[in-house]
C-alpha cells in the first residue's frame, strides 16, 4: 500500500518535500515515478538511479529517500503530485498528493511606503 | 513525429575511432521518459546493443564494448554521438539510433529507429 | 548475460499460413522487458510487441506475443507477403546487461 499526506502546503518562493511511502512484505520497488498532473517531474529506477526532467531540473532534487524536494515554489505549482511505485510482484500502486502554495507570509505583511 | 537521422563517416581505418552522430527531430532529446542508444549490426549478422544515454548525460554501456565506446549528448542541438575506440575489421557494422525506453518499465523497447548507416573498417 | 536462443533459425511458409517463433531465455526475463521486432533487407528494425505481449502502434492483430519466465512465443496468424523477414526478441534488462536473440528468418516456401 501507498501512504501519504494528502494535503501538504508551503509558501512561495519556499520548498516543500513530496513523499510517498510503500510498504509491503514481499514485493521490491523498481521504480518510482513522480509527476505533476501529467508532467513527468522525476524517475527513481533501481537499475539506473534518479532522472529528473530537465523542465525542473533547476527546481527538483532528489530525495530524501525515494521523495522529492521541490524548491523556489511558485503558485504555479499549486495541484495535484501523483508517485507512482513500480513493483515486482506485486504491480504498480499510485499515491496522490495535494499541494497547496500560499503567498509569502513576508509579502503578506509588508507595510505599504509612507506618502 | 519523432525521426532520427544517423550521420558519419562511412570508412574508418583500423585502430582509429570511429565517430557517429544522431539528430533528433520532431522531439525533444530532453523528453524525460526516454534514453537514447545505439545499436549496430555485423553484415549478415544479429543485433547489437552498444550503449545508451539519457539527456542529463546518464549512461549505461554494454559491458562488451564499455572499455571502448563513448556515449555523450548535446542537447542544444538535439543530437547524441558515439565514438568507438581502437576499432577492427570486426567493428564493420550497419549503425542505428534508437529511442530507448528503458524508464518506461512496462514497455521497455526500442520503439524508434533511423534508419542506419554502414561503416566499414578498413585500410 | 542473457542469452536469447531462437529457433528455428529459418522458418519456410506459404501465404495464409501461421507462424509460430520461439525465443528462450537462458535465465528468467520479466515479461515486461521482452520485445519482439522485425527487420526487412536493407531496413532498420521495426518494433511489433513490448512487454511480451502488447502491440506497438501500428501493428496489425494478426502478430502477437505470449510467454512468461524464459519461454516467449511470437505468432503470426495468417502471414500476409509483407511479413515474410526476420524477427528478433531482445531482453530489456539493465543488469546483466540487455541482449538480443539471434533472429528467425520467415521465408517463403
Known amino acids: 500500500t501507498i501512504d501519504t499526506k494528502r494535503n501538504i502546503s508551503a509558501e512561495e518562493g519556499g520548498s516543500v518535500i513530496l513523499q510517498c511511502h510503500f510498504s509491503s512484505d514481499t514485493a521490491e520497488v523498481t521504480q518510482v515515478d513522480w509527476k505533476q498532473q501529467d508532467q513527468l517531474l522525476a524517475i527513481y529506477s533501481v537499475d539506473l538511479g534518479w532522472h529528473v526532467a530537465s523542465v525542473f531540473s533547476d527546481r527538483v532534487v532528489p530525495g530524501p529517500s525515494l521523495g522529492l524536494t521541490f524548491q523556489s515554489l511558485t503558485m504555479n505549482d499549486t495541484g495535484e503530485y501523483f508517485c507512482t511505485y513500480h513493483t515486482y510482484p506485486g504491480g504498480i500502486y499510485k499515491g496522490r498528493i495535494f499541494l497547496k502554495v500560499q503567498e509569502s507570509s513576508v509579502a503578506q505583511f509588508q507595510t505599504a511606503p509612507l506618502g | 513525429q519523432v525521426q532520427l537521422q544517423e550521420s558519419g563517416p562511412g570508412l574508418v581505418k583500423p585502430s582509429q575511432t570511429l565517430s557517429l552522430t544522431c539528430t533528433v527531430s520532431?522531439?525533444?532529446?530532453?523528453?524525460?521518459?526516454?534514453?537514447w542508444g545505439w545499436i549496430r549490426q555485423p553484415p549478415g549478422k544479429g543485433l547489437e546493443w552498444i550503449g545508451s544515454?539519457?539527456?542529463?548525460?546518464?549512461?549505461y554501456y554494454n559491458p562488451s564494448l564499455k572499455s571502448r565506446a563513448t556515449i555523450s549528448v548535446d542537447t542544444s542541438k538535439n543530437q547524441f554521438s558515439l565514438k568507438l575506440s581502437s576499432v577492427t575489421a570486426a567493428d564493420t557494422a550497419v549503425y542505428y539510433c534508437a529511442r530507448d525506453g528503458v524508464l518506461a518499465l512496462n514497455k521497455r523497447s526500442f520503439d524508434i529507429w533511423g534508419q542506419g548507416t554502414m561503416v566499414t573498417v578498413s585500410s | 548475460e542473457i542469452v536469447l536462443t531462437q529457433s528455428p533459425g529459418t522458418l519456410s511458409l506459404s501465404p495464409g499460413e501461421r507462424a509460430t517463433l520461439s525465443c528462450r531465455a537462458s535465465?528468467?526475463?520479466?515479461?515486461?522487458?521482452l520485445a519482439w521486432y522485425q527487420q526487412k533487407p536493407g531496413q532498420a528494425p521495426r518494433l511489433l510487441i513490448y512487454?511480451?505481449?502488447s502491440r506497438a502502434t501500428g501493428i496489425p492483430d494478426r502478430f502477437s506475443g505470449s510467454g512468461s519466465g524464459t519461454d516467449f512465443t511470437l505468432t503470426i496468424s495468417r502471414l500476409e507477403p509483407e511479413d515474410f523477414a526476420v524477427y528478433y526478441c531482445?531482453?530489456?534488462?539493465?543488469?546483466?546487461?540487455?541482449?538480443f536473440g539471434g533472429g528467425t528468418k520467415v521465408e517463403i516456401k
Open positions: 535465465q528468467s526475463v520479466s515479461s515486461s522487458y
Open positions: 544515454i539519457y539527456y542529463s548525460g546518464s549512461t
Open positions: 520532431g522531439g525533444s532529446i530532453e523528453s524525460g521518459l526516454y534514453y
Open positions: 531482445q531482453q530489456h534488462t539493465v543488469r546483466p546487461p540487455l541482449t
Open positions: 512487454g511480451a505481449s
